[in-house]
Interface confidence: low
C-alpha cells in the first residue's frame, strides 16, 4: 500500500494565531485529531469537507482541527492571538509568484501580460470555452483569476475580457525571480521552499525524514519559519533539508540581488588594525598565521582544496591571502601554504579592546579619553577642529577644547548615549562610537520613572479654531511599505522625518520602501485622494540597543487636513501612572487579512516596578522603556503595528511617548506592553533633526 504523503510543508504556519469569522455566512468544519499533520493531510485532499480547504487551525489544547474555506487574506475574517492555536494557510493561495509552470498557482492576479482584464471562468462572455469550474475540480477556477489548470508551458493564463483577444498568459513571476539574497544569504528571510533540483524542503520544526539540530526554538534569530530555505551555518548560499529520504539537504536557487551588499543589521564592525569580537569584520592585511607561516590565496586551490572562495563568499572580502573570518570561527584564519598544515588562526592580530587603551566609558562618557576614532558603522572620525562650527550650532556652551584632540571619539555635548564623532560623510554627519559602558558602571538615571518630575508636554497648546482643536485626526500615522505591502507603522514627527522601529527594515535597499501618509485604509485602493506616497532617502539607526530608527523622507511631507506631525515629549520626562494612552496600527497585514482600516487600542500608563510585577518579575525595565497596560483584555499592539506610536495626552497636547517594537508578545492578557520610551531618546532625535540635512521640497 502506498504511504500517504505528509502535506504539512504545503502550509505557512502562524504560531499562536487563529482566524475569527466576522461574516457568519462563512462555513467551517471541526474534528478531534492528534496532530497538525492530520489536519494538513485532510485539508490538502479536501476529504469529507463541503468546501475547498484553504487553511486550518490546530487547537493544541483541545486536540482539534478547524478547517476553513478562507484564509487570512479573505474578507469577513480577522486574525486573533491565542496561545493554544496554530494557524496553517495553504501557500498556494497566498503566493504571488509561481513555481515551474504555475499549475498550483491559486493567487488573485486577474490581468494578462498586456494589461487586459481576465474574463470570469464561469462566464461565456465574450469567449465561449469548456474550462468550467465544475469540470476542473481542485484547479480553483474561481472569479477571473489567472490559472494553469492543464499545466501548459506558458504558465497561468485566462480568457480575456477583450473580444479580440481570446486568451493570454498572465505576467506572474517565478518565485525564484521574485526574491533575491545578498552575500551568502545569511540574512535571507524569503519564502523559497524548494531546492534547486525541485525537491520540497522539510519543515525546520520537523525531524522527519531527516533529524537535525536546527530547531526554531533553539535558534530564534535564524528565521526558521515553515520550510523556507535558510543559511544558518555559513554555507555559500541558502539550503534546506529535503523531503526526499535519500537527499539529506540541497542548496536552493535564489538569485543574488543587484545591490549585493549586506543588511545594516548584519554588517560586522569593520576594523583594519585589530579584531573586534570574533574578527568577522577584520579587513586588514595580515597574511600569516600565528607562527609566521604564510597564508594560501583564497582564490587558489593549492596546496589545499576548499570552497571558501571569493565567489562563494561574496561579502567576506576574501582578497589576496589576508586573514579573514568568513564562517564565524573564533577568530580570523586562513589556509596555509604549508601542505601539512591545512588551516591556522591569525591570533597575533591584537584585540581592539586592548589596542585602544581606555575601551569603555563611565556615566555618559563625557570624560572618555580613549583613542578610538571609528564610528559604529566603520567610518573614520574626522578632526574635531574641522567641525567646531557644527558643534557650536547644537550646544549652548563652550566645549572643552583640551578634550577634543585629533579625531578621537568624545562626548562634548553631554549626549546621553555615549561618545561620538563627526565623520566627514555628508550623509552621516556624525555617529556614535562602538564603545561600551565599563563593567559595573550603573546606567545614569534621568529621573525616578514612577514619580513624575518633568512634564512631558511642552508649554505650547494646540491652536484652537472656533473651539475645535485642529488636526484631531491621526494624520501623523505612517504606513511603511516594503515592496508595495504594509510592513510597519511610524510617526511623522517632522515634515521630513518618521520615527519607527529598526526591525521594520528587512532589506538594505531603500528603493524597497515607501511611506504612505494621510491614509486610514492600508489597502492599495485608488480612491484615496488624501494619500501622500513618499520615498525613503535615509535610515538613521538609534543609539545602541534602542531599536529606534529615524527614517528620512526623500522630500518633505505636505502638511494638510490629512497629514500632520505629532509632538515629541521633553527629554527625560515621565507621565503619571494611569494616564490614558492609545496605540495605533494596521495590524499584521503581510497577508492583507482584514478591512485594512487603522485600529486603535486604549492603554494606560503603568509604572516600571508594577509593570515588572505583572511580568512575574521576569522582565526588569530600564529607563529606556515605558509600560502600558490594556483597558480591554487582550488588546494591544502586534506584528505589523511595529514602529507605530504609543500616544498620550498631557495638558491638551498629544505626544508620541512610546514606539512599538517586537519581542514582548502580542496583546497577552494581564501582561502590559513594553515600549521604547521616546522621552529617553528625545535629545538624540532632536540632534539628528538638527544636524542631518533635509531634502528641499
Amino acid at each position: 500500500q502506498r504511504k500517504r504523503r505528509n502535506t504539512i510543508h504545503e502550509f505557512k504556519k502562524s504560531a499562536k494565531t487563529t482566524l475569527i469569522k466576522i461574516d457568519p455566512a462563512l462555513k467551517i468544519k471541526t474534528k478531534k485529531v492528534n496532530t497538525a499533520d492530520q489536519c494538513a493531510n485532510r485539508c490538502t485532499r479536501n476529504k469529507g469537507l463541503p468546501f475547498t480547504c484553504k487553511a486550518f487551525v490546530f487547537d493544541k489544547a483541545r486536540k482539534q482541527c478547524l478547517w476553513f474555506p478562507f484564509n487570512s487574506m479573505s474578507s469577513g475574517v480577522k486574525k486573533e492571538f491565542g496561545h493554544e492555536f496554530d494557524l496553517y494557510e495553504n501557500k498556494d493561495y497566498i503566493r504571488n509568484c509561481i513555481i515551474g509552470k504555475g499549475r498550483s498557482y491559486k493567487g488573485t492576479v486577474s490581468i494578462t501580460k498586456s494589461g487586459i482584464k481576465c474574463q470570469p471562468w464561469s462566464s461565456m462572455i465574450p469567449h465561449e470555452h469548456s474550462f468550467l469550474p465544475s469540470s476542473y475540480r481542485g484547479k480553483d477556477l474561481q472569479e477571473n483569476y489567472c490559472r494553469n489548470p492543464r499545466g501548459e508551458e506558458g504558465g497561468p493564463w485566462c480568457f480575456t475580457s477583450n473580444p479580440e483577444v481570446r486568451y493570454e498568459v498572465c505576467d506572474i513571476p517565478q518565485c525564484s525571480e521574485v526574491e533575491c539574497m545578498t552575500c551568502n544569504g545569511e540574512s535571507y528571510r524569503g519564502l523559497m521552499d524548494h531546492t534547486e533540483s525541485g525537491k520540497i524542503c522539510q519543515r525546520w520544526d520537523h525531524q522527519t525524514p531527516h533529524r537535525h539540530k536546527f530547531l526554531p526554538e533553539r535558534y530564534p534569530d535564524k528565521g526558521f519559519d515553515d520550510n523556507y530555505c535558510r543559511n544558518p551555518d555559513g554555507q555559500p548560499r541558502p539550503w534546506c533539508y529535503t523531503l526526499d529520504p535519500h537527499t539529506r539537504w540541497e542548496y536552493c536557487a535564489i538569485k543574488t540581488c543587484a545591490d549585493n551588499t549586506m543588511n545594516d543589521t548584519d554588517v560586522p564592525l569593520e576594523t583594519t588594525e585589530c579584531i573586534q569580537g570574533q574578527g568577522e569584520g577584520y579587513r586588514g592585511t595580515v597574511n600569516t598565521i600565528w607562527n609566521g607561516i604564510p597564508c594560501q590565496r583564497w582564490d587558489s586551490q593549492y596546496p589545499h582544496e576548499h570552497d571558501m572562495t571569493p565567489e562563494n563568499f561574496k561579502c567576506k572580502d576574501l582578497r589576496e591571502n589576508y586573514c579573514r573570518n568568513p564562517d564565524g570561527s573564533e577568530s580570523p584564519w586562513c589556509f596555509t601554504t604549508d601542505p601539512n598544515i591545512r588551516v591556522g588562526y591569525c591570533s597575533q592580530i591584537p584585540n581592539c579592546d586592548m589596542s585602544h587603551g581606555q575601551d569603555c566609558y563611565r556615566g555618559n562618557g563625557k570624560n572618555y579619553m580613549g583613542n578610538l576614532s571609528q564610528t559604529r558603522s566603520g567610518l573614520t572620525c574626522s578632526m574635531w577642529d574641522k567641525n567646531m562650527e557644527d558643534l557650536h550650532r547644537h550646544i549652548f556652551w563652550e566645549p572643552d577644547a583640551s578634550k577634543l584632540n585629533e579625531n578621537y571619539c568624545r562626548n562634548p555635548d553631554d549626549d546621553a548615549h555615549g561618545p561620538w564623532c563627526y565623520t566627514g560623510n555628508p550623509l552621516i554627519p556624525w555617529d556614535y562610537c562602538p564603545i561600551s559602558r565599563c563593567e559595573g558602571d550603573t546606567t545614569p538615571t534621568i529621573v525616578n520613572l514612577d514619580h513624575p518630575v518633568i512634564s512631558c508636554a511642552k508649554t505650547k497648546q494646540l491652536r484652537v479654531v472656533n473651539g475645535i482643536p485642529t488636526r484631531t485626526n491621526i494624520g501623523w500615522m505612517v504606513s511603511l511599505r516594503y515592496r508595495n505591502k504594509h510592513i510597519c507603522g511610524g510617526s511623522l514627527i517632522k515634515e521630513s522625518w518618521v520615527l519607527t522601529a529598526r526591525q521594520c527594515f528587512p532589506s538594505r535597499d531603500l528603493k524597497d520602501y515607501e511611506a504612505w501618509l494621510g491614509i486610514h485604509d492600508v489597502h492599495e485602493r485608488g480612491d484615496e485622494k488624501c494619500k501622500q506616497v513618499l520615498n525613503v532617502s535615509q535610515l538613521v539607526y538609534g543609539p545602541e540597543g534602542s531599536d529606534l530608527v529615524l527614517m528620512k523622507l526623500a522630500r518633505p511631507a505636505v502638511l494638510d487636513d490629512f497629514v500632520s506631525t505629532i509632538d515629541l515629549p521633553n527629554y527625560g520626562c515621565t507621565i503619571p501612572e494611569k494616564t490614558s494612552c492609545s496605540v495605533y496600527g494596521w495590524g499584521y497585514t503581510g497577508l492583507i487579512n482584514y478591512d485594512g482600516l487603522l485600529r486603535v487600542a486604549h492603554l494606560y500608563i503603568m509604572g516600571n516596578e508594577k509593570c515588572s510585577q505583572h511580568h512575574r518579575g521576569k522582565v526588569t525595565l530600564n529607563e529606556s522603556e515605558i509600560c502600558a497596560g490594556a483597558e480591554k483584555i487582550g488588546s494591544g499592539p502586534c506584528e505589523g503595528d511595529y514602529g507605530g506610536p504609543l500616544v498620550c495626552e498631557q495638558h491638551k497636547m498629544r505626544m508620541v511617548l512610546g514606539v512599538i517594537v517586537p519581542g514582548r508578545g502580542c496583546a497577552i492578557p494581564n501582561r502590559p506592553g513594553i515600549f521604547v520610551r521616546v522621552a529617553y531618546y528625545a535629545k538624540w532625535i532632536h540632534k539628528i533633526i538638527l544636524t542631518y540635512k533635509v531634502p528641499q521640497s
Partner: antibody
Amino acid sequence: QVQLKESGPGLVKPSQTLSLTCTVSGGSISSGVYYWSWIRQHPGKGLEWIGYFYYSGNTYHNPSLKSRVTISVDTSKNQFSLKLSSVTAADTAVYYCARDRSGYDHPDAFDIWGQGTMVTVSS
Amino acid sequence: DIVMTQSPDSLAVSLGERATINCKSSQSVLFSSNNKNYLAWYQQKPGQPPKLLIYWASTRESGVPDRFSGSGSGTDFTLTISSLQAEDVAVYYCQQYFSPPWTFGQGTKVEIK
C-alpha cells in the same frame, strides 16, 4: 509633488530615429504603484497613446505603431525614454510623457502629464 | 482596438449655462467584477497638457471644481459642466483604459456663446 519633463531634439530627419527622455522628479520611477506612458498629439488633432512601461520591466505599445517603438528606463537617473524609428512627416507631433496610478491590479487614468515637447520631422 | 466617439465636435454655451458632452465606446468598458467603468475625462487648454478631471467615469479628481461631473455606464458616458465659467473654455477628451491600447475620443471644443 511629482513632475515630468520631456526633453529631446525638436527636429528629426525622415527615416531617422526620434529619441525623447522623460525625467521624473519628486517621486521614484521604481514605485510599484505607477505605469509610465508616452502619448502624442498631432498638430490641431486628438491624442494618441504610444505605449507604457512598468518598473518591473513590462512594456506594451500601440500596435498601430508596429515595431517602431522602444520604451526603456534608467532607474538610476529616474528617467524613461522613447525611441521611434523610421520616422516620417506623419510623426510630427507634441510628445507627452504621463503617469497613471495603475499599480499591479488594474489600469487607471493619467493623473500627471509633462508639459510636452514639439517634434518636427523634416529634411 | 476600442474606438471612442465624442459628440458634438464643438459646443457653444452661454456663461452660467449647462454644457453636456457625450462619449460612446465601441465596446463596454464596464468590468463586472468590480462594477467600475474604465473611462476618464480630460480638459486641455491651448499650449497646455491635458488635465485629468474625472476617472472611473464619475469620480472627480481632487482639486476639480464640483461643477464638473461624469455619468454613464457600459458604452455611453456624459461629461456635464453644470454652470459654464470663462476658464472652462477648452477641448475635452474622453479616454478608455479598459483594454490596451488605451484610446481617446477625438475631442469636443467648448466655447462661450
